[in-house]
């Protein structure tokens, strides 16, 4: 029997060890500079890493600019957006601005985007000083299903800031659903 | 096999509990203010609690004004820091202000520092106003190997909030590295 | 002993499941905004939703204003508090604003109420503009004791977004205490 | 990488006037507090003046109250040092520096508490 429930307990070992990786998909996305679409309207940003620097994924996939749910669960999302402007790199088109970063989800079965999260800030990015930066942070709880998907969309993309440790967003699944 | 199987069930529910534990480090570090550098440039803030108020920490270690991973895994990492200035303090020597914070991560092995984390915003803070206050939040998952350590940076340190409801940083690990 | 090996492995396969998610409050609650105070003072807010749209709890309790603490553990609070004025809603009292958050932790037992987290910034909204939007976030890792309870405080509640990606608050459990 | 330039220095007669421009490039906050120093042959380092970030406030060493003026422009860079009523022993290498601390302090007018030194102009005022 001593036998027996070594073999239990190895087995079991091995079960809770494998079920707990497999059960907490997540993903840490970061920004991809060479593809941010101009203009200052709110538009879906597409293009980020997810697989050098501080990017991975696991357990999720990124398709088509989104980051796609495989495994129901509860999600903690997050999103970190800095933009920032130098006067080296011309005259704003208008010094009032409205910085926004939007994290949505959307559902393919029944086709429809909702907003999850929002933040950000009006700001006056005057001409009296040449050096212009702020950044956002959002995070919350969330019940996803598999399929889901979770975007990003932001307000005026040509200012974000390229840096990996900048403009990012993820998710990790803390629990099942029950 | 009755007697047996309780047996089992017994030690895995030790065993379990104790694994779970054991796998889930955690901080929660609050500026002590009594030791914050004065200047306008980034300075590294080597000076946090860590067993007092909110402050804690388990299967981490705080040395040398850094947070020292212990156990690899996945870590959600974050921080808090609050700036604010009263005209009881003193004179400003610039009212343009750019007021950050950097989470980085310095691996021993490599003698190397990154950032993981940035955020903040320049600021413009008038004499028209006797009060002014900014707070900034970042956050982010991160896969960390025993032995990195976590170091917060920040602009303008004389501006912090001391409180430990206001600056703040803090990590708890999510799951292990596969 | 095969039989009992089976048996014993799926009994342990539903305590895992079951204690897993027994162990594993949250809480996500979204702003009611049907009864928002009026002024620029501080104030408590109470009103929220648990159980429409994106607002949910479990293994918690929401009762007169605050979230209820039903299960020790340390957990991962946040909170997003997003305010805005547009001109069509008449003249601030103050172009000088304080737009902060308070999260606080309150215990029945020793009735005190202490501040967790705080952020916020001073912000001059000025007549130049038409429209104003700022927003906060804060998050960071507590011990919470069963019956302890979490509420939110902010100045100028009338400035409040009332929609619910924008104002909310939660929690969830990342691990038991020792 | 931070560079502070100065330029504008030159020969010019005793009670003559020049203007000094200190440029900042590399770092993305010129707005800062700036400081002029300036060192004659074999002595050391003299404070001139010392202007805020945005301009409103200024203070000048005792030797060249009432003669030199610290100005900026409004779109932040260059900083300026108005030199007038020029005396020989005003002949010196002038330097601008960015002043290191957040608040403005007793210290201001100490060298050690500015960063990013340029080369200098150097200034002779003879006749």
């Known amino acids: 029997i001593r036998a027996e429930k070594a073999m239990v307990d190895g087995s079991w070992l091995d079960l809770a060890k494998r079920s707990k990786l497999e059960a907490q998909p997540f993903a840490h996305l970061t920004i991809n500079a060479t593809d941010i679409p101009s203009g200052s309207h709110k538009v879906s940003l597409s293009s980020w890493y997810h697989d050098r620097g501080w990017a991975k994924i696991s357990n999720m996939t990124f398709s088509n600019g989104k980051l796609i749910v495989n495994q129901d669960g509860f999600y903690y999302l997050y999103a970190n957006i800095c933009f920032r402007h130098h006067e080296t790199s011309g005259d704003l088109a208008t010094e009032y601005l409205q910085l926004m970063v939007y994290v949505t989800k959307t559902s393919i079965k029944i086709p429809s985007s909702h907003t999850l999260m929002k933040g950000g800030s009006t700001k006056y990015w005057s001409g009296n000083s040449e050096f212009h930066f702020y950044s956002i942070n959002v995070g919350g709880f969330f019940k996803l299903r598999s399929g889901e998907e979770i975007s990003i969309e932001v307000s005026n993309p040509s200012l974000l800031d390229p840096d990996q440790d900048a403009t990012y967003f993820g998710a990790f699944k803390v629990r099942d659903i029950d | 096999i009755r007697a047996e199987k309780a047996m089992v069930d017994g030690s895995w529910l030790d065993l379990a509990k104790r694994s779970k534990l054991e796998a889930q480090p955690f901080a929660h570090l609050t500026i002590n203010a009594t030791d914050i550098p004065s200047g306008s440039h980034k300075v590294s803030l080597s000076s946090w609690y860590h067993d007092r108020g909110w402050a804690k920490i388990s299967n981490m270690t705080f040395s040398n004004g850094k947070l020292i991973v212990n156990q690899d895994g996945f870590y959600y990492l974050y921080a808090n820091i609050c700036f604010r200035h009263h005209e009881t303090s003193g004179d400003l020597a610039t009212e343009y202000l750019q007021l950050m914070v950097y989470v980085t991560k310095t691996s021993i092995k490599i003698p190397s520092s990154h950032t993981l984390m940035k955020g903040g915003s320049t600021k413009y803070w008038s004499g028209n106003s006797e009060f002014h206050f900014y707070s900034i939040n970042v956050g982010g998952f991160f896969k960390l190997r025993s032995g990195e350590e976590i170091s917060i940076e920040v602009s303008n340190p004389s501006l912090l909030d001391p409180d430990q409801d206001a600056t703040y940083f803090g990590a708890f690990k999510v799951r292990d590295i596969d | 002993i095969r039989a009992e090996k089976a048996m014993v492995d799926g009994s342990w396969l539903d305590l895992a499941k079951r204690s897993k998610l027994e162990a594993q409050p949250f809480a996500h609650l979204t702003i009611n905004a049907t009864d928002i105070p009026s002024g620029s003072h501080k104030v408590s807010l109470s009103s929220w939703y648990h159980d429409r749209g994106w607002a949910k709890i479990s293994n918690m309790t929401f009762s007169n204003g605050k979230l209820i603490v039903n299960q020790d553990g340390f957990y991962y609070l946040y909170a997003n508090i997003c305010f805005r004025h547009h001109e069509t809603s008449g003249d601030l009292a103050t172009e000088y604003l304080q737009l902060m958050v308070y999260v606080t932790k309150t215990s029945i037992k020793i009735p005190s109420s202490h501040t967790l987290m705080k952020g916020g910034s001073t912000k001059y909204w000025s007549g130049n503009s038409e429209f104003h939007f700022y927003s906060i976030n804060v998050g960071g890792f507590f011990k919470l004791r069963s019956g302890e309870e979490i509420s939110i405080e902010v100045s100028n509640p009338s400035l409040l977004d009332p929609d619910q990606d924008a104002t909310y608050f939660g929690a969830f459990k990342v691990r038991d205490i020792d | 990488e931070v560079q502070l330039v100065e330029s504008g220095g030159g020969l010019v007669q005793p009670g003559g006037s020049l203007r000094l421009s200190c440029a900042a490039s590399g770092f993305t906050f010129s707005r800062s507090a700036m400081g002029w120093f300036r060192q004659a042959p074999g002595k050391g380092r003299e404070f001139v003046g010392f202007?805020?970030?945005?301009?409103?406030?200024?203070y000048y060493g005792e030797s060249v109250k009432g003669r030199f003026t610290i100005s900026r422009d409004n779109a932040q860079n260059p900083v300026y040092l108005q030199m007038n009523s020029l005396r020989p022993e005003d002949t010196a290498v002038y330097y601008c520096g960015v002043y290191r601390r957040t608040y403005i302090s007793s210290t201001y007018s100490e060298s050690s508490e500015y960063d990013y030194w340029g080369q200098g102009t150097l200034v002779t005022v003879s006749s």
């Open positions: 202007i805020t970030g945005s301009g409103g406030t200024t």
